[in-house]
Interface confidence: low
Amino acid sequence: QVTQNPRYLITVTGKKLTVTCSQNMNHEYMSWYRQDPGLGLRQIYYSMNVEVTDKGDVPEGYKVSRKEKRNFPLILESPSPNQTSLYFCASSL
């Protein structure tokens, strides 16, 4: 299964935050998306394996790291109102 944490988050502008994503299926590929009204799912970053990450369609304002296969945290260094969204993490073989 894929687990995101936290499920809900309210924060203030400019305060760094991390949204965690973990999976226990030994998947190599992991990806972060945001879903916004009228825009559908847009990929933020993805990772093909440990230490291999790449930018998706809307990477601006986000960072990621992939130190272990199971974890792929999404980092908002300085959150802004335009990052208010519904975020999804996904993984696959």
């Epitope: 590929y29 093909m48 930018k55 369609d57 990477p59 601006e60 696959s92």
Partner: antibody, heavy 118, light 111 residues
């Protein structure tokens, strides 16, 4: 509007070095990858390498490893290609390009002509 | 390095007819459900222009006359119908493995 503006034509002597620039507008270079491609007269395209301007990480085709140095300055939204020890075979047009769609090059500069001649 | 072999090196097609260009890779360019093969058009004195990304995706602003297909090692660019403005050299390019490589190009002319 996305644009890549490259520096002007260069005439250099054999053995010399040259540094080409590629200034982006309409997007932040640190949100993409920047590439350099070589095209000799009447020849095909050769991939030189790429840089991730967000962190400076570079990757080169091994045949250009000792020839080319790619750098970027996010503050000026500019990528650079430095070519060293130029022989006449390096006479070519050098293109910069923006990378997205997982590495396809969706916008290109107009090219910089480099002529190596004594 | 992955070698991309384009064929034919040149072709002449009548206006309104179909042009088909092939690109064969020396090894698979597929990863994670994607084919990392792209197609570009270059006209004399101009930089290349992206037509198709990831094998079959039409770049924004490119006419639907252009289409791409294929997977793993065999890819095709199709122009149907060919128009006078399509006279150019077409290149395939792979980005599945470093170093990225280009095919040798196919020159399209009007018959």
């Amino acid at each position: 509007e996305v644009q890549l503006q490259q520096s002007g034509a260069e005439l250099v002597k054999p053995g010399a070095s040259v540094k080409l620039s590629c200034t982006a507008s309409g997007f932040k270079t640190e949100d993409t990858y920047m590439y350099w491609v070589k095209q000799r007269p009447e020849q095909g395209l050769e991939w030189i390498g790429r840089i991730d301007p967000a962190n400076g990480n570079t990757k080169y085709d091994p045949k250009f490893q000792d020839k080319a140095t790619i750098t970027a300055d996010s503050s000026s939204n500019t990528a650079y290609l430095q070519l060293s020890s130029l022989p006449s075979e390096d006479t070519a047009v050098y293109y910069c390009a923006r990378g997205s769609y997982y590495y396809a090059m969706d916008y290109w500069g107009q090219g910089t002509s480099v002529t190596v001649s004594s | 390095d992955i070698v991309l072999t384009q064929s034919p090196a040149s072709l002449a097609v009548s206006l309104g007819q179909r042009a088909t260009i092939s690109c064969r890779a020396s090894e698979s360019v597929d990863s994670y459900g994607n084919s990392f093969m792209h197609w570009y058009q270059q006209k004399p004195g101009q930089p290349p222009k992206l037509l198709i990304y990831r094998a079959s995706n039409l770049e924004s602003g490119i006419p639907a006359r252009f289409s791409g297909s294929g997977s793993r090692t065999d890819f095709t660019l199709t122009i149907n119908p060919v128009e006078a403005d399509d006279v150019a050299t077409y290149y395939c390019q792979q980005s599945n493995e470093d170093p990225y490589t280009f095919g040798g190009g196919t020159k399209l002319e009007i018959k």
